[in-house]
C-alpha cells in the first residue's frame, strides 16, 4: 500500500515567495520621477520577478524630527494622493502582488522613532495600522526597532491589531542588530512576526561560518517561520563582493523562510559603482540612460534591460530561483537538513514528503573544491542518492539537467549548485 501523504501546512501568502523592498520611490523610478502613479507602471516588472509582496515606502508625511508634523495617515503629496495609492493597490491585487506599507515614523529624521514621546508615536502607529488595513493594505513594516523603547510590547500590540483584522495580514519588523539573543528576545513575545535583521551580514567569510549562523538561527527559532536577508533595508552589494551575489541569491531563495530583497538586488545594483549616489538608495538602473551624471559609467550588463536579454545574467538567475521557490513544495515548506560537505562549503537538503527533493551546495571560497558530502549526518528520511540532476549552477558552463555523481562533485570558486532528485521510498 502507498504511504500516506503528509498533511500540508497552512501557507500564508508571504510563505510562497520573496518580498521586494522599494524604500525610496524616487531612486527606484529615477529620471526625476518617483511617485505612486509611476510605480504602478512598474508592477509588470515586479510580476516578472515573481515576487509575492512589495514593501513600500515610507510614503507618509514626515517633517524631519517633528512629531506634530508627522502624519502616518497622510501620503506625502510628493509621492501622490490617496487615489493614486488606492489605484496602485487595486492594480497590484490584480497581479497577485501584495502591498506592505512601511510605517517607520521619522524616516527623514535622526531617530526613526523620535527620541521622546514614545507613547504618542505608538498611538499614531496604532491609528495608522487600523486606517491602512481598512484601506486594503496587506501588511506593514517598521524598521530600526532597536531605537524604540519597549519594542517587544509595542510590536505585540501592533501584531494583535494587524492579525485582529485578518490572519492574512503581515507585520514585518526590522532591526540593525546582528545579535542572535537580541533578535530572539524580539521574536519570543511576537508569534508570526517577520523580522529582518543584520544577522547574516557578516556571513560572507566562509561556508562553515554561514552554516553555523543559519543552523544556530533555525535551531533557536524552532518551528517559527523565518525571513532571510542581509539587512533590514540595504542592498546585498553593501555587504558582499560581486562574486558572491549569485551564491547568496541561491541561498536566500532556498533556505526555509521568506527571502527579502531590496530593489536592485536582482541586478547587483551597487552604489559604489555610481559616483555621487547614496549608499542606502542608489538610482535603479533600468537602462544605460538611468544614470546620466557620468557618461559611460553604466554599461548594458549593469541594467535591467541588458540583463533581461542575457540568460546568464544575475537577473535571469533571480527570476529562475524565484520561480522555483514559488512552485516547488520542498522549497515552499520542506524540511531543512544541513550537513557536512568539506571545508569552505555549506550544503543542505530541502525535502517534503514524496515530492521532488533539492540539494544545495555552496562554495564560499575563492578556490575550487571537491565536495565530500557526509550523508551520514542526514536522517533516514532525507538520505542522498548516488546521483542528482543539475537544476542550475550560479556559474556558466555546466550542462543543466545532466545527472551529477554526488561522490565526485567539484565546485568552482564561489559556485553554488541547485540539484534535484526524486523521493525514493
Amino acid at each position: 500500500r502507498a504511504p500516506r501523504c503528509r498533511e500540508l501546512p497552512a501557507q500564508k501568502w508571504w510563505h510562497t515567495g520573496a518580498l521586494y523592498r522599494i524604500g525610496d520611490l524616487q531612486a527606484f523610478q529615477g529620471h526625476g520621477a518617483g511617485n505612486l502613479a509611476g510605480l504602478k507602471g512598474r508592477l509588470d516588472y515586479l510580476s516578472s520577478l515573481k515576487v509575492k509582496g512589495l514593501v513600500l515606502g515610507p510614503i507618509h508625511k514626515n517633517q524631519k524630527d517633528d512629531v506634530a508634523q508627522t502624519d502616518l495617515l497622510q501620503i506625502d503629496p510628493n509621492f501622490g494622493s490617496k487615489e493614486d495609492f488606492d489605484s496602485l493597490l487595486q492594480s497590484a491585487k490584480k497581479k497577485s502582488i501584495r502591498v506592505i506599507l512601511d510605517l517607520t515614523p521619522n524616516y527623514r529624521g535622526e531617530n526613526s522613532w523620535f527620541s521622546t514621546q514614545v507613547d504618542t508615536v505608538a498611538t499614531k502607529v496604532k491609528d495608522a495600522l487600523e486606517f491602512w488595513l481598512q484601506a486594503g493594505v496587506d501588511g506593514f513594516q517598521v524598521r530600526d526597532i532597536e531605537n524604540l523603547k519597549d519594542a517587544s510590547s509595542f510590536l505585540a500590540e501592533w501584531q494583535n491589531i494587524t492579525k485582529g483584522f485578518s490572519e492574512d495580514r503581515l507585520l514585518i519588523a526590522g532591526t540593525n542588530s546582528s545579535d542572535l539573543q537580541q533578535i530572539l528576545s524580539l521574536l519570543e513575545s511576537n508569534k508570526d512576526l517577520l523580522l529582518t535583521s543584520s544577522y547574516l551580514s557578516d556571513s560572507g567569510s566562509t561556508g562553515e561560518h554561514t552554516k553555523s549562523l543559519v543552523t544556530q538561527y533555525l535551531n533557536a527559532t524552532g518551528n517559527r517561520w523565518c525571513s532571510w536577508s542581509l539587512s533590514q533595508a540595504r542592498l546585498l552589494t553593501s555587504f558582499l563582493p560581486a562574486q558572491l551575489l549569485r551564491l547568496y541569491q541561491l541561498m536566500l531563495f532556498t533556505l526555509p523562510g521568506t527571502p527579502v530583497f531590496s530593489y536592485g538586488d536582482e541586478i547587483g545594483l551597487d552604489a559604489a559603482a555610481l559616483p555621487g549616489q547614496p549608499m542606502e538608495a542608489p538610482v535603479m538602473l533600468w537602462d544605460e540612460s538611468s544614470f546620466p551624471d557620468i557618461p559611460g559609467a553604466v554599461s548594458a550588463n549593469m541594467t535591467v534591460k541588458g540583463q533581461s536579454e542575457d540568460p546568464g545574467s544575475l537577473l535571469s538567475l533571480f527570476r529562475r530561483l524565484s520561480d522555483q521557490r514559488s512552485k516547488e513544495r520542498s522549497l515552499l515548506h520542506g524540511d531543512f537538513h544541513a550537513f557536512s560537505a568539506g571545508p569552505g562549503l555549506f550544503s543542505y537538503i530541502r525535502h517534503w514528503d514524496q515530492n521532488e527533493r533539492f540539494l544545495v551546495v555552496l562554495n564560499f571560497g575563492d578556490v575550487g573544491l571537491s565536495a565530500g558530502l557526509q550523508a551520514s549526518d542526514l536522517p533516514a528520511s532525507a538520505s542522498l542518492p548516488a546521483k542528482a540532476d543539475l537544476l542550475l549552477s550560479t556559474q556558466p558552463g555546466r550542462e543543466e539537467g545532466s545527472p551529477l555523481e554526488l561522490e565526485r562533485l567539484k565546485l568552482e570558486p564561489h559556485e553554488g549548485l541547485l540539484l534535484r532528485f526524486p523521493y525514493a521510498a
Epitope: L73, D86, T123, K124, D127, D168
Partner: antibody
C-alpha cells in the same frame, strides 16, 4: 459612563468662523477617535471629519478648505472650527466617538448644539 | 465619494408588523481583506442625536433589541424591524464606513405607525 457634550455660540455671522468645543468624559482620548457630524434643520446627516487618538485627522473633502479639527488632551476637549460660514452652514453640530476597532461607526453621540448663521 | 440611497423615504407600519428599510451604495462596501461589509445603521428619534444600531452590516451594537437586524452585502442592504414597537418611531440612516473618507450617510427613512 461615556459622555460627549458640544458647546459654543448658537449664532454666528456670515463670513465669520464658527468655533465649537466637544468635552468628553468616561473614556481615554488616547484610545478613541472622535467624529464631527452636522445636520441642517429637517435634513439628513453630513460627516465633517474624524480626529484619531494619535491626532491624525480625516476631513470631508467638500469642507476641507474651511474646517479645522484639533484636540486639547489636557482639557479632554476636541474643537471644530469652520471658517467663512454662510446660511448653508446652519445646522445641529454633533461630536461622536469612533467606537470600534476596524470600523468608523459612532457608538456614543453628544446631544448636539444648534448653530445658526445669520446677520 | 460613495453615494448612499435609501428607500423608501417614509414608511408606515402597524404595531407588531415587520418594517423593512433598504439602502443601496454606489460601490461595494465589502472589504476583501477581512470579509466584512462596512455599512452602519443609526436610529434618530425626534429631538435626539442618532443612536448606533448595527455595524458591519449585521453586527448588532450591545444593548440594541434583537428585533433589529441588518443584512445584505456588496451594494444592497436591509434593516429589518421584525415586530415594530411604538418606541421604534424614528428616522433611520445607513452610513458607509468603508475604506477612505468621506463616510457618507443615506438621506434617511422615516418610520411611523400606521
Amino acid at each position: 459612563q461615556v459622555q460627549l457634550q458640544e458647546s459654543g455660540p448658537g449664532l454666528v455671522k456670515p463670513s465669520e468662523t464658527l468655533s465649537l468645543t466637544c468635552t468628553v468624559s468616561g473614556f481615554s482620548l488616547t484610545s478613541y477617535g472622535v467624529h464631527w457630524i452636522r445636520q441642517p434643520p429637517g435634513k439628513g446627516l453630513e460627516w465633517i471629519g474624524l480626529i484619531w487618538a494619535g491626532g491624525s485627522i480625516n476631513y470631508n473633502s467638500a469642507l476641507m478648505s474651511r474646517v479645522t479639527i484639533s484636540v486639547d488632551t489636557s482639557k479632554n476637549q476636541f474643537s471644530l472650527k469652520l471658517s467663512s460660514v454662510t446660511a448653508a452652514d446652519t445646522a445641529v453640530y454633533y461630536c461622536a466617538r469612533k467606537g470600534h476597532m476596524y470600523s468608523y461607526a459612532m457608538d456614543y453621540w453628544g446631544q448636539g448644539t444648534l448653530v445658526t448663521v445669520s446677520s | 465619494d460613495i453615494v448612499m440611497t435609501q428607500s423608501p423615504d417614509s414608511l408606515a407600519v402597524s404595531l407588531g408588523e415587520r418594517a423593512t428599510i433598504n439602502c443601496k451604495s454606489s460601490q461595494s462596501l465589502l472589504n476583501s481583506g477581512n470579509q466584512k461589509t462596512y455599512l452602519t445603521w443609526y436610529q434618530q428619534k425626534p429631538g435626539q442625536p442618532p443612536k448606533l444600531l448595527i455595524y458591519w452590516a449585521s453586527t448588532r451594537e450591545s444593548g440594541v433589541p434583537d428585533r433589529f437586524s441588518g443584512s445584505g452585502s456588496g451594494t444592497d442592504f436591509t434593516l429589518t424591524i421584525s415586530s415594530l414597537q411604538a418606541e421604534d418611531v424614528a428616522v433611520y440612516y445607513c452610513q458607509n464606513d468603508y475604506s477612505y473618507p468621506p463616510w457618507t450617510f443615506g438621506q434617511g427613512t422615516k418610520v411611523e405607525i400606521k
